[in-house]
Interface confidence: low
């Protein structure tokens, strides 16, 4: 055991190079100076170290920087970043966008790991402010990151970032988030033609106002029921039977299967029964024929 702690004669590393891949773990521990490793971190990524060897290198950095790595080292961690725990990353102070990009690149193509989530959190705290370039970077690597932000935070997402968003990335967004994202998507896609526009905007329609749904109903878009069911109830309620029929096109028959669920249930309650009957779907619960319909918002204003 005692011999293993001393570096064998002639094996002391003078630089970080490929010869180190032949070192046993204990030799790396004994023969690689932590300060040398820190100054030549950019070389580590180009050398095919084993995971066990990377563990040793990480241990050396941990000993050198017990309070957390400096940004000069963090920026060049490369695949060693995958060895870091969230606890390690919480000690860091990351302020450079280049550092963030370099580490996100390492994790590119994978789901957001706890390490990445912690890194982004540290970056936000370290910088104090997030400008549009930073947000562009985050959404480029993790479009789904949008749904982890509060509506307040989303308010300054640049419309250009919306282009990177895939439908599945909005699955976890709630209505308040879509309220903010929808107008940005509308702006981002405004120069597309009708059918292409609908394909792109569809995922964001949970934030669309009534006026926009009415406009879409005039464009033969054939919205599917899954999309319709995610629309805001308050945006759907003012739509007429004819508008919903045009909006859904051949998918209108799906209303029968959803008649007990929002927003379909609430919409049915607002329609005249004889209008609903024109759909031929057997939808029940509309306002009986001959009843006077009061505009409740007007009634409140008068009282």
């Amino acid at each position: 055991e005692v011999e293993k702690t001393a570096c064998p004669s002639g094996k002391k590393a003078r630089e970080i190079d490929e010869s180190l891949i032949f070192y046993k773990k204990w030799e790396l521990e004994a023969c690689v100076d932590a300060a040398l490793l820190a100054t030549q971190m950019d070389r580590v990524n180009a050398i095919p170290f084993t995971y066990e060897q990377l563990d040793v290198l990480k241990h050396k950095l941990d000993e050198l920087y017990p309070q957390g790595y400096p940004e000069s080292v963090i920026q060049h961690l490369g695949y060693l970043f995958l060895k870091m725990s969230p606890e390690d990353i919480r000690k860091w102070n990351v302020t450079s966008l280049e550092t963030l990009k370099a580490l996100l690149e390492v994790n590119k193509g994978h789901e957001m790991s706890p390490q990445v989530a912690t890194l982004i959190d540290r970056f936000v705290k370290g910088r104090g402010q997030l400008d549009k370039d930073t947000l562009d970077t985050l959404t480029a690597f993790y479009p789904g990151y949008l749904c982890s932000l509060s509506p307040e935070e989303l308010s300054s997402v640049p419309p250009s970032s919306i282009w990177a968003v895939r439908p599945q990335d909005l699955d976890t967004c709630d209505p308040r988030q879509l309220d903010v994202l929808y107008p940005k998507a509308r702006l981002a896609f405004q120069n597309m033609n009708g059918s292409e526009y609908f394909v792109k905007i569809q995922s964001f329609l949970g934030g669309a106002p009534t006026e926009d749904l009415k406009a879409l109903s005039q464009q033969n878009v054939s919205m599917d029921l899954a999309t319709f069911m995610k629309l805001r109830t308050d945006a759907v309620l003012p739509l007429t039977v004819a508008e919903v029929q045009k909006l859904l096109g051949p998918h209108v028959e799906g209303l029968k299967a959803e008649e007990r669920h929002r927003p379909v249930r609430d919409w049915i309650l607002r329609q005249r029964q004889d209008d609903l009957d024109t759909l031929g779907l057997g939808l029940q619960g509309g306002i009986p024929n001959g009843y006077l319909v009061l505009d409740l918002s007007m009634q409140e204003a008068l009282s």
Partner: antibody, heavy 120, light 109 residues
């Protein structure tokens, strides 16, 4: 022609709640293209952003005022409102309501402003 | 918070002359900067946004330039109606925290 009109009491006692309303006419408060904001200006001083609200009710507040602030919208009345609690003399200012395009944080149309004095 | 600093606090220029107003941000705001004009007893009016784009109805004698942290508003030939207080505003931050400069008073020399 869009018009924004602030209304509310011109005098509020310290520790009470300042309440103002902005009425939008000549344009749609429910437009998905705009936020509606409040900015204030103490006498003889510069401008301070208070917060903004979207037609859906989502509101965004200045961090320094967040704990005392509530901004809401009533689309049926074409109005949005400001409530600032626990006021002090430092809240004495001309309060402006303004329109903010959703694609940026600038204010492209302003009301004429209303002076609110906090004094006992 | 991004702090916006305008200089000078007061600028005295004769009508027909050129006026140059400066605005400095404590950190980069990219090109997300607006200029407003405010006359006594009136609300501010948007002049320039995106650093250099004139708002609707603003005369060509008003121009803006700069990027990052240093910005300039230039009025090429001062008219009597241009004498007022000018404010710059950044809208680059996230979460939103829009801040204004303290203002530059442009007065007749």
């Amino acid at each position: 022609q869009l018009q924004l009109q602030e209304s509310g009491p011109g005098l509020v006692k310290p520790s009470e709640t300042l309440s103002l309303t902005c009425t939008v006419s000549g344009g749609s408060i429910s437009s998905s293209s705009y936020y509606w904001g409040w900015i204030r200006q103490p006498p003889g001083k510069g401008l301070e952003w208070i917060g903004s609200v979207y037609y859906s009710g989502s509101a965004f507040y200045s961090p320094s005022l967040k704990s005392r602030l509530n901004i809401a919208v009533d689309t049926s009345k074409k109005q949005f409102s400001l409530k600032l609690s626990s006021v002090t003399a430092a809240d004495t200012a001309v309060y402006y309501c303004a329109r903010r395009p959703y694609k940026s944080g600038l204010f492209d149309f302003w009301g004429q402003g209303t002076l609110v004095t906090v004094s006992s | 918070e991004i702090v916006m600093t305008q200089s000078p606090a007061t600028l005295s220029v004769s009508p027909g002359e050129r006026a140059t107003l400066s605005c400095r941000a404590s950190q980069s705001v990219s090109s997300n900067l607006a200029w407003y004009l405010q006359k006594p007893g009136q609300a501010p009016r948007l002049l320039i946004y995106g650093t250099s784009t004139r708002a609707t109805g603003i005369p060509a004698r008003f121009s803006g330039s700069g990027s990052g942290t240093e910005f300039t508003l230039t009025i090429s030939s001062l008219q009597s109606e241009d004498f007022a207080v000018y404010y710059c505003q950044q809208y680059n931050t996230w979460p939103p925290e829009y801040t204004f400069g303290q203002g530059t008073k442009l007065e007749i020399k």
